[in-house]
Amino acid sequence: LPAQVAFTPYAPEPGSTCRLREYYDQTAQMCCSKCSPGQHAKVFCTKTSDTVCDSCEDSTYTQLWNWVPECLSCGSRCSSDQVETQACTREQNRICTCRPGWYCALSKQEGCRLCAPLRKCRPGFGVARPGTETSDVVCKPCAPGTFSNTTSSTDICRPHQICNVVAIPGNASMDAVCTSTSPTRSMAPGAVHLPQPVSTRSQHTQPTPEPSTAPSTSFLLPMGPSPPAEGSTGD
């Protein structure tokens, strides 16, 4: 039987597969047409009649060529901490991803099952590793000569200003206070600039030691709140 001349349904030659977009129906023992994405098999094929396909109903879908009797249900609506990045259509499931300021704590095949707010580093701590779509912020204590006076998921430790005359020495959570009218800001060569909120003061940074690669201990799951990790604060 030359390829692609027989019309479905047809009995394949022994040892031959069915052709493109066909499946072998064990009951009919025939090669039959699959249904296209957005459809499902309303009536299965027989020895004399091909598959009858029908469109998926609202809120259901099939993404692949198939011969399923019913379309799959689209996932539930996205929660308030998520945005819908792909709508539910006859050919694709809804996809929900985390909104800005949140990360995916529990992913699913496509999109996110559970979003969690990005950790905020409290004063005296800065961002060692920024948050991503799937990982939380990692905080670290500000090294000597640097400070952070904010509670933020983006701010890093910044160098103290250099005073001609120091009024109040800086610490990990506070900048130095100068008596001089013209303080000079320390500028490290090859400074790294992480994304930061716009501020009225200059925010030069200096290279910092590599953050610890120890895993975050604050992992928000629906089993109730856990104590915040060192240097972080809950929302």
Epitope: A3, Q4, P12, G15, S16, T17, R19, L20, R21, K34, L64, W65
Partner: antibody, heavy 119, light 107 residues
Framework: QVQLVQSGAEVKKPGASVKVSCKAS????????INWVRQAPGQGLEWIGW????????QYAQKFQGRVTMTTDTSTSTAYMELRSLRSDDTAVYYC????????????WGQGTTVTVSS | DIQMTQSPSSLSASVGDRVTITCRAS??????LNWYQQKPGKAPKLLIY???KLHSGVPSRFSGSGSGTDFTLTISSLQPEDFATYYC?????????FGGGTKLEIK
């Protein structure tokens, strides 16, 4: 990662047979067709056929029917293509490729096996 | 068998250029048109399937369009790594058939 690794180059005499192997890794071997495609020197691509490893059933291009045999060994995730009665115009690079039977594309390719037919 | 005809057979262009390659099928193949890139001594790589769906990991500067018998592959802004030979292939009917290829060279 998903990959297909083919056997080494072969030199054959006209009238002989050649058997090329293709070892799959990084995915479930039995759930995708393995296709064979060849490319003569400086020429385009030509589809030879496919085999479905789950049941060993095949689909060959008419041109190669009777001269080609595709087989698989699911225990080693390896596909084989044997071409018989070789002629000089069978000199080509033979590729195995994982195929999608719904859209008819080849998404993962082996590195190719050069088969030279010369007297 | 369905014949696939590509044009041009070769093409010279510069980095940053917008390039279009066309592929014509001898009969209607709906949207079952796939595009591959091949570099010398290497296996082809899938770029686009089902006329316009980008294969995973393929840069968005590649796009496909058309339907029925006439299709195009467009590279919006040529990069140095894009100089290669491009093949179209129909996935509508057996036997699966390829175009003769378009060699994209540096001008």
């Amino acid at each position: 990662q998903v990959q297909l690794v083919q056997s080494g180059a072969e030199v054959k005499k006209p009238g002989a047979s050649v058997k090329v192997s293709c070892k799959a890794s990084g995915y479930t071997f039995i759930t995708y067709d393995i296709n064979w495609v060849r490319q003569a020197p400086g020429q385009g691509l030509e589809w030879i056929g496919w085999i479905y490893p789950r049941d060993g059933n095949t689909q060959y291009a008419q041109k190669f029917q009777g001269r080609v045999t595709m087989t698989t060994d699911t225990s080693t995730s390896t596909a084989y293509m044997e071409l018989r009665s070789l002629r000089s115009d069978d000199t080509a690079v033979y590729y195995c490729a994982r195929g999608d039977r719904d859209y008819g594309y080849f998404d993962v390719w082996g590195q190719g096996t050069t088969v030279t037919v010369s007297s | 068998d369905i014949q696939m005809t590509q044009s041009p057979s070769s093409l010279s262009a510069s980095v940053g250029d917008r390039v279009t390659i066309t592929c014509r099928a001898s009969q209607d193949i709906s949207n079952y048109l796939n595009w591959y890139q091949q570099k010398p001594g290497k296996a082809p790589k899938l770029l686009i399937y089902f006329k316009s769906k980008l294969h995973s990991g393929v840069p968005s500067r590649f796009s496909g369009s058309g339907s029925g018998t006439d299709f195009t592959l467009t590279i919006s802004s040529l990069q140095p790594e894009d100089f290669a030979t491009y093949y179209c292939q129909q996935g509508n009917t057996l036997p699966l058939t390829f175009g003769g290829g378009t060699k994209l060279e540096i001008k």
